[in-house]
Interface confidence: low
């Protein structure tokens, strides 16, 4: 197909465009056409600009001519000058490039002349009659800035189609002037439109960042997502990050908030900063810097040991006075030689008995000054209804010192597919002080219910960790905390947490933590029934140190912040020392994360193209007063360039037609 019968085409650089219009026009018509589009007839003043014109025009047919913006009035010959007396339609004669086809003629230049460029060969300049209609014309458009052509995306149905401010539609652009529109058609049938706009930080750029064809799904470029790409129902995609990572500001890449090791001991993704720091058992966050950990002096906690306590970094030990020996719980003391089982078996009674050493509850709060405490003890929870309760404890016997944990049936807990969790905390980070009361089990303040919130990103239903919830009245029963009843056998029913060994208090939730899929529990457990708990009491989950001596506080109210489970040893070690180091696996208090309905990550809104319209006010290089091509005036004195800013003011046609009729020479290209 003859390219000259085709559509106009353009070549753009960062500051200007040349456009070729293959339309038969006179010089005046061509000039008007360029002005109406906001440009001018082409003024290739430099070799670089000439190269761009060359590349645009290409190798056209041999006889074809294109008007450019050079015009000379009658009798204005200046043959010694580079432009030979011709003036650019922008009003000046500045040039660093000429490409005349013929040497200058020495004639008197009686008629107005205009310059056309040969479409073939070396694109030489020919002068000729301005009234002659040639095969086309070249326009030039200047502008403040340009946007680079869009990179093709794999999801595109074809190349981007650009519409310039001068109404040229093409796919073949390297640069797009300010005000251009890019239309991208996607294979999914949808499309995207972008505008080349001024950017707030200066310069120009596209109104929207890619990828544009998200509707084509997640391939072949994973939707631009670093981790997971999810195809939504409406055809667009959203990016998600694997657990332990968060979506970056670009909505596509993922970042690991703990990668920079912001915490001294343990880091967990989540929280307002993107991560939260936790301290191991026996440590608490430093008051001046929550990223650091300082040793907790557990011995300052009333009743932590029945008799004597020695604190050390990361833990503590209980001791007994002469004639007494430490019981298996590591806390209580009994007369040397006496069997310790009785004291422990009487725990239920002691919990509910009135103690002799009463301590004002407010004083206890003040004394502990809000410090974090990782204490063994009893975790009180606010109930939604009065629970039954059974203590998961079996008396110790010399031949078998190991308390056992109930063995779940093969179908319980249900199997989970375990995602990799890069950071998990094995701490119970207590953010409220221990409440000590010798007279009754202390209930949490109504204003401060002890909830255990999940601070890590919500998991899918398949990957959720069970709940020890304080206030979840609306949760379906499957997600409510299970309470062990006095009348239940040792085999726990589905959806209830198994009993917890008081000596090895690792918590085995009803839905086993996906972080540790290989954990195994063996053995059976008998229960020691406690006396009935009054209906206003909260459900009790026993953990380490549940066998409290008579002088011990009734309960420890814990408010936790760390929510993930510690690594649970498959084979539980025997306790061979009286050491009460909370760091030892046998003395870790483990709290499962709250099970919450899976919350989908916030989806990125599908960006619609910017709806603003940008007024196009191209600035032209060498923008002296725009010149209107004039045809021959009545006398040389009047054949001057008259600046006129109004592009609509058409030049007057003065008798050139008559001249042309009488002068064969004027109609020929020299």
């Amino acid at each position: 197909q003859d390219p000259w019968a085709a559509e106009p085409r353009a070549a753009c650089g960062p500051s200007s465009c040349y456009a070729l219009f293959p339309r038969r026009r006179t010089f005046l018509e061509a000039w008007r056409a360029c002005r109406e589009l906001g440009g001018d007839l082409a003024t290739p003043r430099t070799p670089e600009e000439a190269q761009r014109v060359d590349s645009l025009v290409g190798a056209g047919p041999a006889s074809r001519l294109l008007w450019i913006g050079l015009q000379r009035q009658a009798r204005q010959c200046q043959l010694q000058r580079p432009l030979r007396g011709f003036t650019w339609t922008t009003g000046d004669q500045d040039t660093a490039f000429t490409n005349w086809a013929q040497p200058a003629s020495g004639g008197p230049c009686p008629a107005q002349r205009c310059v056309a460029l040969e479409a073939s060969g070396e694109h030489r300049w020919l002068e000729g009659s301005c009234t002659l209609a040639v095969d086309g014309y070249l326009c030039q458009f200047g502008f403040e800035g340009a946007c680079p052509a869009l990179q093709d995306e794999a999801g595109q149905a074809g190349p981007a189609v650009y519409t310039t401010p001068f109404h040229l539609v093409s796919t073949e652009f390297e640069w797009l002037p300010f005000g251009s529109v890019a239309a991208v058609q996607c294979q999914a049938g949808r499309g995207a439109s972008l505008l080349c706009v001024k950017q707030p930080e200066g310069g120009v750029g596209w109104s929207r960042a890619g990828p544009l064809c998200l509707g084509t799904g997640c391939s072949p470029d994973n939707g631009g997502c670093e981790h997971e790409c999810v195809e939504e129902v409406d055809g667009h995609v959203s990016c998600r990050c694997t657990e332990g990572f968060r979506l970056a500001a670009d909505g596509r890449s993922c970042e690991d908030p703990c990668a920079q090791a912001p915490c001294e001991q343990q880091c967990e993704p989540g929280g307002p900063q993107g991560y939260s720091c936790h301290c191991r058992l026996g440590f608490r966050p430093a008051e001046d810097d929550p990223h650091r950990c300082v040793d907790t002096d557990e011995c300052q906690i009333a009743g932590v040991c029945q008799q004597m306590c020695v604190n050390y970094v990361g833990g503590f030990e209980c001791y007994c006075s002469e004639g007494h020996e430490l019981e298996a719980d590591g806390i209580s003391c009994s007369p040397a030689g006496a069997m310790g089982a009785q004291a422990s078996q009487d725990l239920g009674d002691e919990l509910l008995d009135d103690g002799e050493d009463e301590e004002d509850e407010d004083e206890a709060w003040k004394a502990f000054n809000g410090g974090w405490t990782e204490m063994p003890g009893i975790l009180w929870m606010e109930p939604t209804q009065p629970p039954d309760f059974a203590l998961a404890y079996r008396p110790s016997f010399p031949e078998d010192r190991e308390p056992q944990i109930p063995y779940p049936e093969p179908t319980w807990p249900p199997p989970l597919s375990a995602p990799r969790v890069p950071y998990h905390s094995s701490v119970l980070s207590v953010t409220r002080p221990v409440v000590v009361s010798a007279t009754h089990p202390t209930l949490p303040s109504a204003h401060q219910p002890p909830v255990i919130p999940a601070t890590h990103p919500a998991l899918s239903r398949d990957h959720q960790i069970p709940v020890i919830a304080a206030n979840y009245p609306d949760l379906p029963s499957a997600y409510q905390p299970g309470i062990l009843s006095v009348s239940h056998s040792a085999q726990p029913p589905a959806h209830q947490p198994p009993m917890i060994s008081t000596k090895y208090p690792e918590l085995f939730p009803a839905h086993q933590s996906p972080m540790f899929p290989d954990t195994r529990v063996a053995g059976t457990q008998t229960t020691t029934h406690l006396p009935g708990i009054p209906p206003n009491h909260a459900p009790l989950v026993t953990t380490l140190g549940a066998q409290l001596p008579p002088q011990a506080p009734d309960a420890l109210v814990l408010r936790t912040q760390a929510t993930q489970l510690p690594i649970i040893p498959t084979a539980q070690p025997s306790l061979t020392t009286t050491s009460r180091s909370p760091v030892s696996p046998a003395h870790q208090i483990s709290v499962p994360a709250a099970t919450q309905p899976a919350a989908l990550p916030t989806l990125l809104p599908s960006q619609s193209p910017t709806n603003q319209t940008s007024p196009i006010s191209p600035t032209h290089p060498h923008s002296k007063a725009p010149q209107i091509p004039r045809e021959d005036g009545p006398s040389p004195k009047l054949a001057l360039w008259l600046p006129s800013p109004a592009p609509t003011a058409a030049p007057t046609a003065l008798g050139e037609a008559g001249l042309a009729e009488h002068s064969q020479r004027d109609d020929r290209w020299l």
Epitope: Q151, E153, G217, S219, P220, C229
Partner: antibody, heavy 116, light 107 residues
Framework: EVQLVESGGGLVQPGRSMKLSCSAS????????MAWVRQAPTKGLEWVAS????????YYRDSVKGRFTISRDTAESTLYLQMDSLKSEDTATYYC?????????WGQGVKVTVSS | DIVLTQSPTTLSVTPGETVSLSCRAS??????LHWYQQKTNESPRLLIK???QSNSGIPSRFSASGSGTDFTLNIKDVEFDDVSSYFC?????????FGSGTKLEIK
């Protein structure tokens, strides 16, 4: 564990047809683009075709367009490549791959020999 | 089509050396460039995705960099187990294309 197992290869005469299957397990098949990549003996890897998650969008290399058809059965978690009008230059080991853009899981490959 | 040119075709190194494999694209592929390792008689294995992101389970000895049209795969402290062919692949535009591969040998 993600597994892709190809089947259906063998010896076939030029101009004849053959259908390859790829059974997928260990991931949610419907959520992923899938692709076929081939490797001629002692040669490099060559992408053949890809299919969108629903099987509605399909993409082919020019040399197989009109002759090969990629399809998927979401219910069966199976990917197919129907190869018609086979040519000797189609001789290769054909791999089924999960296409996240990059190919993150590959099958063990199935050999297709086109020869008279 | 985007053509990916890999060099060298074959690379012979001694264990413990660090090597660089090059992949050059005929057009810009942005960051949509990936690297695969293929051992003899095995399926390819994804090493690096999106220019420099290591796939899970890949030793940290493997790293990659580059942008636009020039990309490099680096292998530190080469081991006998690294003897393989290494291919780059682009997912910038259809058709998806692979480089012709670089074969790594141990002296």
């Amino acid at each position: 564990e993600v597994q892709l197992v190809e089947s259906g290869g063998g010896l076939v005469q030029p101009g004849r047809s053959m259908k390859l299957s790829c059974s997928a397990s260990g991931f949610i098949f419907r959520n992923y683009y899938m692709a076929w990549v081939r490797q001629a003996p002692t040669k490099g890897l060559e992408w053949v075709a890809s299919t969108g998650t629903g099987g509605d969008f399909t993409y082919y290399r020019d040399s197989v367009k009109g002759r090969f058809t990629i399809s998927r059965d979401t219910a069966e978690s199976t990917l197919y490549l129907q190869m018609d009008s086979l040519k000797s230059e189609d001789t290769a080991t054909y791999y089924c791959a999960r296409a996240y853009g990059y190919f993150d899981y590959w099958g063990q490959g199935v050999k297709v020999t086109v020869s008279s | 089509d985007i053509v990916l040119t890999q060099s060298p075709t074959t690379l012979s190194v001694t264990p413990g050396e660090t090597v660089s494999l090059s992949c050059r694209a005929s057009h810009s592929v942005g960051t949509n460039l990936h690297w695969y390792q293929q051992k003899t008689n095995e399926s390819p294995r994804l090493l690096i995705k999106y220019v420099s992101q290591s796939n899970s389970g890949i030793p940290s000895r493997f790293s990659a960099s580059g942008s636009g049209t020039d990309f490099t795969l680096n292998i530190k402290d080469v081991e006998f187990d690294d003897v393989s062919s290494y291919f780059c692949q682009q997912t910038q535009s259809w058709p998806l294309t692979f480089g012709s591969g670089t074969k790594l040998e141990i002296k």
